[in-house]
């Protein structure tokens, strides 16, 4: 049952999309078994979830990647959940790191991030990774979402 | 505080159970510190959580496993969160993959999956893994649950 | 929008704090982009989240650590989410385990735990790890929180 017009459910779950862009910000799409509850949360430019209402949100991301220690930089693979509020620099909310595998040609690993954060109207959240070319885009492997408490 | 009879809280958290079955679908039990809020969510046949009400649910699973690269197939260990709606094939909602460890006799790793999905009345969710014999069933290691928004 | 005075939102998200204590219980702080919705959830002694109201809570923790197989004990790194109810022994709610990396000087890995549990008034939850000296305290790497359904 909906909470009523005054307090509708707000939730989103979007699916990773391979991108030719060299940016470290992951791309997402409303495809497959996605969720977009209403226009109080939107996917903007395929890269960020933007909310219209202030409040507490549980925000999460899952990233599966395939990497090899020899073929990668010495630094680990890092996924970051970031916040961009109007008129402010972005800031890191959550990060996870996994050292590259020794498996060949590459070893798959999955990262899950999630936490409760206060978002202001117009705030956007996005996911940044150290090497987007290593991200796995097979069904269900990489996704991003939020729900308003 | 409950939301009222019209909109009761719906949540479940079940605990992994070792199984002699060769199926790749994990088995669960209402044991230990489990949660089953009411009869609007049920554990069926020890393998799937079934909901009676349509709506948005946050669904999650955690799987800890112990594997060794030499003793396992070359494919990674994959855990899948799947949806079975009446009269339809199951579909994969979320997946995570971890390459097997080189530790001996085996190396433990944990996978966490979670996301927001729309479920129809009678829909069931379950967890599938590539090798159930590798799953760790010690206290707290492997669990599965959901909550209705 | 708040649920009203009768049923306020209850949520917390706290940030890891390095500690000189040798205890295996992780330390947390209300710093950075933290959440503490109201006084119905409190951070006590920098180590446990304590709730005043009975109910179902989604509780989560994320721990990033850096370890090396040769420099560590043979046992894996284990993170445990534990419950302490008034007048009772603590109990393990969730655990995750990751075998140490062979990377040098150490390899980073991230663990995520989360589940729905019934908490009594005055109940506390905390996070325990096998080796707190291996935990990463950089921005966003290690955090702990809950939300009341």
């Amino acid at each position: 049952m909906q909470k009523g017009d005054q307090n509708p459910q707000i939730a989103a779950h979007v699916i990773s999309e391979a991108s030719s862009k060299t940016t470290s910000v992951l791309q997402w799409a409303e495809k497959g078994y996605y969720t977009m509850s209403n226009n109080l949360v939107t996917l903007e430019n395929g890269k960020q979830l933007t909310v219209k209402r202030q409040g507490l949100y549980y925000i999460y991301a899952q990233v599966t990647f395939c990497s090899n220690r020899e073929a990668s930089s010495q630094a680990p693979f890092i996924a970051s959940l970031c916040l961009k509020s109007p008129g402010r620099f972005e800031r890191i909310l959550l990060r996870a790191a996994n050292t590259h595998s020794s498996a060949k040609p590459c070893g798959q690993q999955s990262i899950h991030l999630g936490g409760v954060f206060e978002l202001q109207p117009g705030a956007s959240v996005f996911v940044n990774v150290t090497d987007p070319s290593q991200v796995s885009h097979g069904t269900g492997f990489t996704s991003f979402g939020l729900l308003k408490l | 505080m409950q939301k009222g009879d019209q909109n009761p809280q719906i949540a479940a958290h079940v605990i992994s159970e070792a199984s002699s079955k060769t199926t790749s679908v994990l088995q669960w039990a209402e044991k230990g510190y489990y949660t089953m809020s009411n009869n609007l969510v049920t554990l069926e046949n020890g393998k799937q959580l079934t909901v009676k009400r349509q709506g948005l649910y946050y669904i999650y699973a955690q799987v800890t496993f112990c594997s060794n690269r030499e003793a396992s197939s070359q494919a990674p260990f994959i855990a899948s969160l799947c949806l079975k709606s009446p009269g339809r094939f199951e579909r994969i909602l979320l997946r995570a993959a971890n390459t097997h460890s080189s530790a001996k006799p085996c190396g433990q790793q944990s996978i966490h999956l979670g996301g927001v999905f729309e479920l129809q009345p009678g829909a069931s969710v379950f967890v599938n893994v590539t090798d159930p014999s590798q799953v760790s069933h010690g206290t707290g290691f492997t669990s599965f649950g959901l909550l209705k928004l | 929008m708040q649920k009203g005075d009768q049923n306020p939102q209850i949520a917390a998200h706290v940030i890891s704090e390095a500690s000189s204590k040798t205890t295996s219980v992780l330390q947390w702080a209300e710093k950075g982009y933290y959440t503490m919705s109201n006084n119905l959830v409190t951070l006590e002694n920098g180590k446990q989240l304590t709730v005043k109201r009975q109910g179902l809570y989604y509780i989560y923790a994320q721990v990033t650590f850096c370890s090396n197989r040769e420099a560590s004990s043979q046992a894996p790194f284990i993170a445990s989410l534990c419950l302490k109810s008034p007048g009772r022994f603590e109990r393990i709610l969730l655990r995750a385990a990751n075998t140490h990396s062979s990377a040098k000087p150490c390899g980073q890995q991230s663990i995520h735990l989360g589940g729905v549990f019934e908490l009594q008034p005055g109940a506390s939850v905390f996070v325990n790890v096998t080796d707190p000296s291996q935990v990463s305290h950089g921005t966003g790497f290690t955090s702990f929180g809950l939300l009341k359904l």
Partner: nanobody, 123 residues
């Protein structure tokens, strides 16, 4: 390029058993429902059985229910059909087929087919 290669057909006596295999390549096998379809000599195509991506859902034509069992091994990218209590009317070319989408009902369309393997049931 999607490829489906059936094997395991042959001549068997009534009441006997056979196990058909279908090796899949060129797509992510574990994402898709799969099925078996057959064509008896001089007749049209008949759907036999289907299975969901992880083997949780199985569907059978009434004519084979209780005698045939469909299964899959996602680690080997292989689909199987165990055929027991075979009858003369089971004689046909058996085709392995891939569904076009990752979800849906078992009467939706297949988008790729194998070359088929001949099963002959005769004394």
């Amino acid at each position: 390029e999607v490829q489906l290669l059936e094997s395991g057909g042959g001549l068997v006596q009534p009441g006997g058993s056979l196990r058909l295999s279908c090796a899949a390549s060129g797509f992510t096998f574990m994402d898709y429902p799969m099925g078996w379809v057959r064509q008896a000599p001089g007749k049209g195509l008949e759907w036999v059985s289907s299975i969901g991506p992880v083997g949780m859902s199985t569907y059978y034509a009434d004519s084979v229910k209780g005698r045939f069992t469909i299964s899959r091994d996602n680690s080997k990218n292989t689909l199987y059909l165990q055929m027991n209590s075979l009858r003369a009317e089971d004689t046909a070319v058996y085709y392995c087929a891939k569904y076009g989408g990752t979800s849906g009902r078992h009467n939706t369309k297949f988008d790729y087919w194998g070359q088929g393997t001949l099963v002959t049931v005769s004394s």
